[in-house]
């Protein structure tokens, strides 16, 4: 960076090298060049020479003033015009940064994704700070009073093996950067209450020929949790609003859910689950696309329909009486 150059003097920033975005700042340059009484002192920002708001303080020092500085990062350097020197002489350089102190972290959430072996804690960091901001996650056992701290730049994965202080913990997040420090409210957790079941996945769909054709969605999860509640949402891809069906589920076998849908329409399905009565849901599964047949086929036929809409690949095989979709795309 600019800070590694050999200096013939020095450059400094008031109020500081890292300052609040939108502040008025002054950059000072002081020359210390042998056999040179500088005629002029020049400032450069990101390689562009500054024209305005330069004031000479004394024989060796000048000040560059910026009003309402809004750039997150800038490389500054200054030069001197020395008599009898054809080129400007480099004095010194400095990288400067502007940003904001961190907001109070809120919406602190800790979950254990089944089989992950980790407790994942996330939070809303608030507005962008633009400068290096670190987060310390504090985890304190309510049983042993022992506290552990984890340093991170965003979220944190804490091995469940390291949570030796029983089941109940307090979790809070401290945010800090050069401009300030803030601390979240404390979140009380019980390890048994924050487990999210293994992801539910829709594997295929088929539309069955009947007086009123029905579509069956096949879906499954590898969870070992016995009591699981799930939601499946679906809509025509052209619609904005979702329809939601709720299920109490036992994943000892593949789930089959029936839907009575309009013909010749492309639908999207997603599923999510939670341990019954607990707080946290899985994220919605990847979209699964299925197009209902125009009319129910009366004769045996084979066809393949390739559909790459929205990165999803639908392969449909038609045979007498039903249509099957197998969509493993994203």
């Amino acid at each position: 960076g600019i800070t590694n150059i050999n200096c013939s003097g020095h450059i400094w920033v008031e109020p500081a090298t890292i300052f609040k975005m939108g502040m008025n700042i002054s950059i000072y340059c002081q020359a210390a060049i042998k056999n040179c009484q500088p005629r002029k002192l020049h400032f450069y920002k990101n390689g562009i020479k500054e024209r305005f708001q330069i004031t000479r303080i004394n024989k060796t020092t000048a000040r560059l003033w910026y009003k309402n500085f809004l750039e997150p990062h800038a490389s500054m350097y200054c030069t001197a015009e020395c008599p009898k020197h054809f080129q400007e002489t480099l004095i010194c350089g400095k990288d400067i940064s502007s940003g904001y102190p961190p907001d109070i972290p809120d919406e602190v959430t800790c979950v254990i994704y089944e089989y992950s072996g980790n407790m994942t804690c996330t939070w809303n960091a608030g507005k962008l700070t633009y400068i290096d901001t670190k987060y310390v996650v504090h985890v304190k056992s309510l049983e042993t009073e022992e506290e552990q701290q984890y340093l991170t730049s965003s979220y944190i994965n804490i091995s469940t093996d390291s949570l030796q202080g029983g089941k109940k913990y307090l979790v809070w997040v401290q945010a800090a950067n050069a401009l300030g420090m803030e601390e979240s409210k404390q979140l009380q957790i019980h390890l048994d209450d924050i487990v999210i079941p293994s992801a539910a996945v829709i594997s295929r769909a088929e539309t069955i020929n009947a007086t009123v054709p029905k579509t069956i969605i096949y879906w499954d999860s590898q969870t070992t949790i016995e009591k699981v509640s799930c939601e499946m949402r679906y809509k025509a891809t052209t619609n904005q609003t979702w329809n939601v069906k709720e299920f109490d589920t036992n994943f000892t076998y593949v789930q089959q859910s029936e839907f009575y849908l309009e013909p010749n329409i492309k639908y999207v399905f997603q599923v999510r689950c939670q341990e019954t009565g607990k707080r946290y849901w899985q994220p919605w599964s990847s979209p699964f696309f299925h197009k209902t047949p125009e009319t129910v086929p009366q004769v045996t036929s084979k066809a393949f329909q390739h559909d790459t809409w929205n990165s999803g690949l639908t392969v449909a095989s038609i045979s007498t009486g039903h249509l099957t979709s197998d969509n493993r795309g994203d």
Partner: antibody
Framework: QVQLVESGGGVVQPGRSLRLSCAAS????????MSWVRQAPGKGLDLVAD??????????YYADSVKDRFTISRDNSKNTLYLQMNSLRAEDTAVYYC??????????WGQGTLVTVSS | DIQMTQSPSSLSASVGDRVTITCRAS??????LAWYQQKPGKAPKLLIY???SLQDGVPSRFSGSGSGTDYTLTISSLQPEDFATYYC?????????FGQGTKVEIK
């Protein structure tokens, strides 16, 4: 050798517009700052507008008396400097000189073009 | 902006005279001063820059000196072609500013 030739002056009514041009030759136009300096009849020299060189990213400056009325610009491909003068006033009557500077003192000057603002 | 005060505003002199014109800045300008000559109906012409450096092609009878806030243009032996108006210009801080001019007339 350096040559600066202004054009576009003339008599104009108050409130009207005029565009001055300055054709430059004999130097690396991109590397020099260009200015318009005016001289009212029987008066001294005043910097009206300035457009810096490439090293300053062509920063522009205007005297308070012409801010929001005059616009300085340059076409580096044509080695030409312009001054767009809008909402002209009687006090804008002057000889307008195009001048070139490498540092901030004016090294070379054009012959000037007279702008008369009168009803 | 830096203010430049020139004196005298006019002077009468004869051919062969030594003429001195002074320019005072409202603050230290660190020898960032230029002198110009302007004849009626003509553009200004650069004589001196950096307070004491003679521009190419300018006769050696012209010289400049000074530091800090006070600067001087000297014509060692006034010639007929030197009757003109002289301006100083500071370019230490932006924007550059001119003195109000000194008119050198024939006595």
């Amino acid at each position: 050798q350096v040559q600066l030739v202004e054009s576009g002056g003339g008599v104009v009514q108050p409130g009207r517009s005029l565009r001055l041009s300055c054709a430059a030759s004999g130097f690396d136009f991109n590397s020099y700052g260009m200015s318009w300096v005016r001289q009212a009849p029987g008066k001294g020299l005043d910097l009206v507008a300035d457009i810096s060189s490439k090293s300053y990213n062509y920063a522009t400056y205007y005297a308070d008396s012409v801010k929001d009325r005059f616009t300085i610009s340059r076409d580096n491909s044509k080695n030409t400097l312009y001054l767009q003068m809008n909402s002209l006033r009687a006090e804008d009557t002057a000889v307008y000189y195009c001048a070139v500077h490498h540092s901030d003192y004016f090294e070379y000057w054009g012959q000037g073009t007279l702008v008369t603002v009168s009803s | 902006d830096i203010q430049m005060t020139q004196s005298p505003s006019s002077l009468s002199a004869s051919v062969g005279d030594r003429v001195t014109i002074t320019c005072r800045a409202s603050q230290d300008i660190y020898t960032n001063l230029a002198w110009y000559q302007q004849k009626p109906g003509k553009a200004p012409k650069l004589l001196i820059y950096h307070a004491s450096s003679l521009q190419d092609g300018v006769p050696s009878r012209f010289s400049g000196s000074g530091s800090g806030t006070d600067y001087t243009l000297t014509i060692s032996s006034l010639q007929p072609e030197d009757f003109a108006t002289y301006y100083c210009l500071q370019d230490s801080e932006y924007p550059p500013t001119f003195g109000q001019g000194t008119k050198v007339e024939i006595k």
